[in-house]
């Protein structure tokens, strides 16, 4: 089965690479996950995304869990997911009406 992910291998400043031009087809039977790396810097939030094998992504996210402190300067969070384009934009919260 082939999965599609958003991919920007180099960090993008304040651009979460979630527009159509960043969509790629991952390698069949090898890259079965989408990965997202979010780094918080003084200049803003940096995003890096790619396809990944489940082993590689899980090794990375587990090994670097201690570096993830959302909202804190120099925090780096790595997440893995396995549905199409799941490393895209976070769904916007609906305002209560």
């Amino acid at each position: 089965l082939q999965i599609q992910c958003y991919q920007c291998e180099e960090f993008q400043l304040n651009n979460d690479c979630s527009s159509p031009e960043f969509i790629v087809n991952c390698t069949v039977n090898v890259q079965d996950m989408c990965q997202k790396e979010v780094m918080e810097q003084s200049a803003g939030i940096m995003y890096r995304k790619s396809c990944a094998s489940s082993a590689a992504c899980l090794i990375a996210s587990a090994g670097y869990q201690s570096f993830c402190s959302p909202g804190k300067l120099n925090s780096v969070c790595i997440s893995c997911c396995n549905t199409p384009l799941c490393n895209g934009p976070r769904p916007k919260k609906r305002g209560s009406s």
């Epitope: 790619s50 082993a55 090794i59």
Partner: antibody, heavy 120, light 107 residues
Framework: EVQLVESGGGLVQPGGSLRLSCAAS????????IHWVRQAPGKGLEWVGR????????YYADSVKGRFTISADTSKNTAYLQMNSLRAEDTAVYYC?????????????WGQGTLVTVSS | DIQMTQSPSSLSASVGDRVTITCRAS??????VAWYQQKPGKAPKLLIY???FLYSGVPSRFSGSGSGTDFTLTISSLQPEDFATYYC?????????FGQGTKVEIK
């Protein structure tokens, strides 16, 4: 035990070609980036390029772009550096190293290096 | 490309001395900096990753600090086996540039 072993170095004439191998054991290369780094005699470390073996995605230093090609054979757990149009300034010890493909990760295991000499 | 500039390029010190090597990035690299030790004829060895984390098996006399653009490697009490060349390297984006190296020699 994690190990990287380079081979294929030697003496080659300017304009010639050489293929270096980096055989990995103790880990699966598909879970890591494999980097090539070189060191000219008496000089510092210079990054050459890298491959993410699971996708085949490669990046190269400007100094070797268009002349060097990095590839990997995941069934052999081995990465390669194909060097074409070699120049005298490519003379160096070539190392392969592994790096988890996340920002904060570093090159934690290195091979012993293989010497490439480009001379007529 | 982001440049990494090390200083000094060489230094002379005695066993027991405290040694400090600095590395400056030309742009913010957060904490994505590593330090390596290399002895003549040998491959580099990882000492510090992510600016301040001691790699497994590395003696605690080595420490790293810094974030953004300024980074420091400190050897609290220099030992005979520490005479070597030290390199900083940024792991943030491609290319993962190395500093030019600092040679630590015996005084």
């Amino acid at each position: 035990e994690v190990q990287l072993v380079e081979s294929g170095g030697g003496l080659v004439q300017p304009g010639g070609s050489l293929r270096l191998s980096c055989a990995a054991s103790g880990f699966t290369i598909t879970n890591y980036g494999i980097h090539w780094v070189r060191q000219a005699p008496g000089k510092g470390l210079e990054w050459v390029g890298r491959i993410y073996p699971d996708s085949g995605a490669t990046y190269y230093a400007d100094s070797v772009k268009g002349r060097f090609t990095i590839s990997a054979d995941t069934s052999k757990n081995t990465a390669y550096l194909q060097m074409n149009s070699l120049r005298a300034e490519d003379t160096a010890v070539y190392y392969c190293a592994r790096k988890l493909w996340v920002t904060l990760a570093s090159m934690d295991y290195w091979g012993q290096g293989t010497l490439v000499t480009v001379s007529s | 490309d982001i440049q990494m500039t090390q200083s000094p390029s060489s230094l002379s010190a005695s066993v027991g001395d405290r040694v400090t090597i600095t590395c400056r990035a030309s742009q913010d690299v957060s904490t994505a900096v590593a330090w390596y030790q290399q002895k003549p004829g040998k491959a580099p060895k990882l000492l510090i990753y992510s600016a301040s984390f001691l790699y497994s098996g590395v003696p605690s006399r080595f420490s790293g600090s810094g974030s953004g653009t300024d980074f420091t490697l400190t050897i609290s009490s220099l030992q005979p086996e520490d005479f070597a060349t030290y390199y900083c390297q940024k792991s943030y984006n491609t290319p993962p540039t190395f500093g030019q190296g600092t040679k630590v020699e015996i005084k």
